[in-house]
Amino acid sequence: MPNSEPASLLELFNSIATQGELVRSLKAGNASKDEIDSAVKMLVSLKMSYKAAAGEDYKADCPPGNPAPTSNHGPDATEAEEDFVDPWTVQTSSAKGIDYDKLIVRFGSSKIDKELINRIERATGQRPHHFLRRGIFFSHRDMNQVLDAYENKKPFYLYTGRGPSSEAMHVGHLIPFIFTKWLQDVFNVPLVIQMTDDEKYLWKDLTLDQAYSYAVENAKDIIACGFDINKTFIFSDLDYMGMSSGFYKNVVKIQKHVTFNQVKGIFGFTDSDCIGKISFPAIQAAPSFSNSFPQIFRDRTDIQCLIPCAIDQDPYFRMTRDVAPRIGYPKPALLHSTFFPALQGAQTKMSASDPNSSIFLTDTAKQIKTKVNKHAFSGGRDTIEEHRQFGGNCDVDVSFMYLTFFLEDDDKLEQIRKDYTSGAMLTGELKKALIEVLQPLIAEHQARRKEVTDEIVKEFMTPRKLSFDFQ
């Protein structure tokens, strides 16, 4: 992770290589312009930080201390002036083309292998979630440490979050919450969910009231995932920051120990960004430390945090892990998920403003059917004859991808994969299978959401003692 000490030059070089590989992966997978530009902006900023620290341009495949011939290769200074989108643009389009094994190597995380999955099964006495079995959550940092603690009856807690940028949530947004709910159930641990309404106010054209109201609306969808009210605290930053001195003290501690150069490198900030943006990463980091929640953990600082998140969030928590020992706290552990594909496949961005880019939690059964049939990118052949002869491609077929996320029955999924790949199952039949999974899933979610009253939301969002037994 980039920081101001000279020893970090190689780390900064490696961060650029990592980000470069991510950019290449996104480009090779035909990700959306917003997503690519966001990643490129971060990369350009990292390169500028490298030049400032090293006194020379970053050179691909030429680490610091390995002098390279003088070069004017690469984009001129004006390259940085091309239009980019901020890193906080929601990045949830398809990961087609991304080699996750390579990302693990580049990011320096660890693969969630069979051994770790078996260990989770032994520790919990529960069958591993299909997100684990199917490699949807595929990478981790320090999960073995969490299991060590758990097996020794030592506590840990879960932390996840949501940037409430609009009232419309789609099925992709449910992935971390579905998995976090499972983790909460099997480990029987407390959970904090951060609603970063302050972040959205800083980045989007919203009033404070709008940002907060989105947080409350989104909280209803999150609550509908079935979280235990006695073990879950959902908080709005705008609300909680002003009432929790423990939380704010940690924010300030983090702010003191992270340089502008570091956040510039990670988040792609420029001199024209408002100071609210620059200090925001500290607010996202603070829930990783248990004494940010004195009503739950009192003043304890030794309780480890486990954060389930998408792999593109990892740089943010690398900063958190970097700062933790410097302020006397344990590093949070991480579980990384793959990206969730847009209906149209890798070439388009899944966005709350495009109703056809995904299945929204507000969609009717008819809308779901129409969207899947009309817009879900198909890996099928051009003609029935060709499809019967050569079979379909499950690797690019969005309906099949969605089934890997939402069809829990492994045997059924494998049968569908075999039938579609062999040509026995046609695209229309595959889409029908997905519709039959999604319609009840969304209908049930909507029914549960209807039952979430303002009083229930208020209780989830009230700082309070949670019921669990920590030694």
Epitope: Q19, G20, E21, V23, R24, K27, A28, N30, S32, K33, I36, D37, V40, L43, K59, A60, D61, C62, N66, A68, P69, T70, S71, N72, H73, G74, P75, D76, T78, E79, E81, E82, D83, Q347
Partner: antibody, heavy 121, light 110 residues
Framework: EVQLLESGGGLVQPGGSLRLSCAAS????????MSWVRQAPGKGLEWVSA????????YYADSVKGRFTISRDNSKNTLYLQMNSLRAEDTAVYYC??????????????WGQGTLVTVSS | QSVLTQPPSASGTPGQRVTISCTGS????????VYWYQQLPGTAPKLLIY???HRPSGVPDRFSGSKSGTSASLAISGLRSEDEADYYC???????????FGGGTKLTVL
Amino acid sequence: EVQLLESGGGLVQPGGSLRLSCAASGFTFSSYDMSWVRQAPGKGLEWVSAISSGGSSIYYADSVKGRFTISRDNSKNTLYLQMNSLRAEDTAVYYCARDVAWDMLGDFDYWGQGTLVTVSS
Amino acid sequence: QSVLTQPPSASGTPGQRVTISCTGSSSNIGSNYVYWYQQLPGTAPKLLIYANSHRPSGVPDRFSGSKSGTSASLAISGLRSEDEADYYCGAWDDSLSAYVFGGGTKLTVL
């Protein structure tokens, strides 16, 4: 599906001009650096020119500097190569290629099928 | 004459392992990534290896790339008849501010 389709090739006399186009589809053209690469009959590949995604960085091979101009129109998803003062040694199949590297490194993951340019009197 | 030097030809029998070398200098291979392209007869080139040793999705693991100093090599194991093609290495050259290719190696499967 990613597609690159070159056009504009043909027979031209030495000293003449041609403008090649490369129509891109199936991806967000404005996010990618692009290059022209040529191949003379029976010979190897020769890189000709590259342009960054926004058009602000441009590079040429020494053999075409001052004669060829690369440009792009992101609103039309099209890459161009304006070739002036053509010589017999410019005779080749011209390919446009998409660069997926993040720094114009020549990571050409998709190529067009090529358009033949013949310079002869 | 090409900036990057490749043997003009190579050959092997089915199942064999063949290696194609690519030699450059400190201004190209020495300080930049190497890429390998396969060109089957009558078709456009295809990316085979990127960033020295990485395979794009869809490229069989029989193909592997490596780089050491100012040289790079492409290895093809378990040679098949469909591997018969021209193979090109490529890298950015800092001195020239240009992308350079090797002259190409014609691989024959005997």
